[in-house]
């Protein structure tokens, strides 16, 4: 028999924390698990217990994470990993759109993320997806093309910058805009 | 920094039990994570247990998992390291250590990460 199949590892309410507010860490195996073991990866940190709790995110705690478990013996393969971000460690970037922020169904629309400071890594959201579109750019901006927009894309976005050689310590969001669909 | 200071520690024949304890001054040690580390003649300090500053975690090397158990008292600024099932490579000197200024309650298995160190209690197993 192989190795045991892998958990699943959570942050709790999400993965992009702003400095100084709380955050839980679950990791997740199946029923009657014998132990879990937690680590954050590249600093020799461990925990036996399945829920690490975060009372105040600082900058240090920012990184990736991982987690496993044993059933008698045997080892689980580990979790895919976590990036665990803290927001708030730089001034917000803007956030705008060309042509403009109500667009016609069909149409095309460029979401601009600018930032002040030499940032190379933009990472877009939109409210209610799970994952950001990320773009690296070198010139302290980042264009995201929507081509051929639809009733889908209309929402709240907000923009994130960060330095790829710091790539867990991220902006605060940029205000929100709010692309309209006709 | 933390003032620390280990007890408890003596001759005990293989299979007993001892129960280390480690008593800490400074005001920094309800937030500090602890650990119990140890140093067999000849060989390299190793970390054996660590409590978060809460109590709430834990974490402990693979020789010892299920036969140590860590643990404290924020209340009377110890922390205790209860050894069963003890065997002749468990002699060694045991120290405390502090770490005080990681934020989280992961603990850290590097010895470097740990700033404060007791002077170390002698434990013997054998028959």
């Known amino acids: 028999s192989g190795p045991l199949p892998k958990p699943s590892l959570q942050a709790l309410p999400s993965s992009l924390v702003p400095l100084e507010k709380p955050v839980t860490l679950r990791c997740q195996g199946p029923p009657g698990v014998d132990l879990y073991r937690l680590e954050k990866l590249s600093s020799s940190r461990y925990q036996d217990q399945a829920v690490l709790f975060i009372p105040a995110m600082k900058r240090s705690l920012a990184g990736r994470y991982r987690c496993s478990y044993q059933n008698g013996s045997l080892w689980s393969l580990p979790s895919d990993q976590l990036e665990l971000v803290a927001t708030g460690v730089f001034a917000k970037p803007s956030l705008s759109a060309q042509p403009g922020p109500a667009v016609s169904s069909g149409g095309d629309v460029t979401l601009q993320c600018q930032t002040r400071y030499g940032f190379d890594q933009f990472a877009l959201y939109k409210e209610g997806d799970p994952a950001p579109y990320k773009n690296p750019e070198r010139w302290y901006r980042a264009s995201f093309p929507i081509i051929t927009v639809t009733a889908a894309h209309s929402g709240t976005y907000r923009c994130y910058s960060f330095s790829s050689r710091d790539p867990y310590l991220w902006s605060a969001p940029s205000d929100p805009l709010e692309l309209v669909v006709t | 920094q933390v003032q620390l200071q280990e007890s408890g520690g003596g001759l005990v024949q293989p299979g007993g039990s001892l129960r280390l304890s480690c008593a800490a001054s400074g005001r920094t040690f309800t937030r500090s994570i602890m650990g119990w580390f140890h140093q067999a003649p000849g060989k390299e300090r190793e970390f054996l247990a660590g409590?978060?500053?809460?109590?709430?975690?834990?974490y402990y090397a693979d020789s010892v998992r299920g036969r140590f158990t860590i643990s404290r008292d924020n209340a009377k600024n110890t922390v205790s390291l209860q050894m069963n099932s003890l065997n002749p490579e468990d002699t060694a000197v045991y120290y405390c250590?502090?770490?005080?200024?990681?934020?989280?309650?992961?603990?850290?298995?590097?010895?470097?990460?740990?700033?404060?160190w007791g002077r170390g209690t002698q434990v013997t197993v054998s028959s």
């Open positions: 250590a502090a770490d005080p200024s990681h934020p989280g309650s992961l603990i850290s298995t590097r010895r470097s990460d740990y700033d404060s």
């Open positions: 409590i978060s500053w809460s109590g709430a975690n834990t």
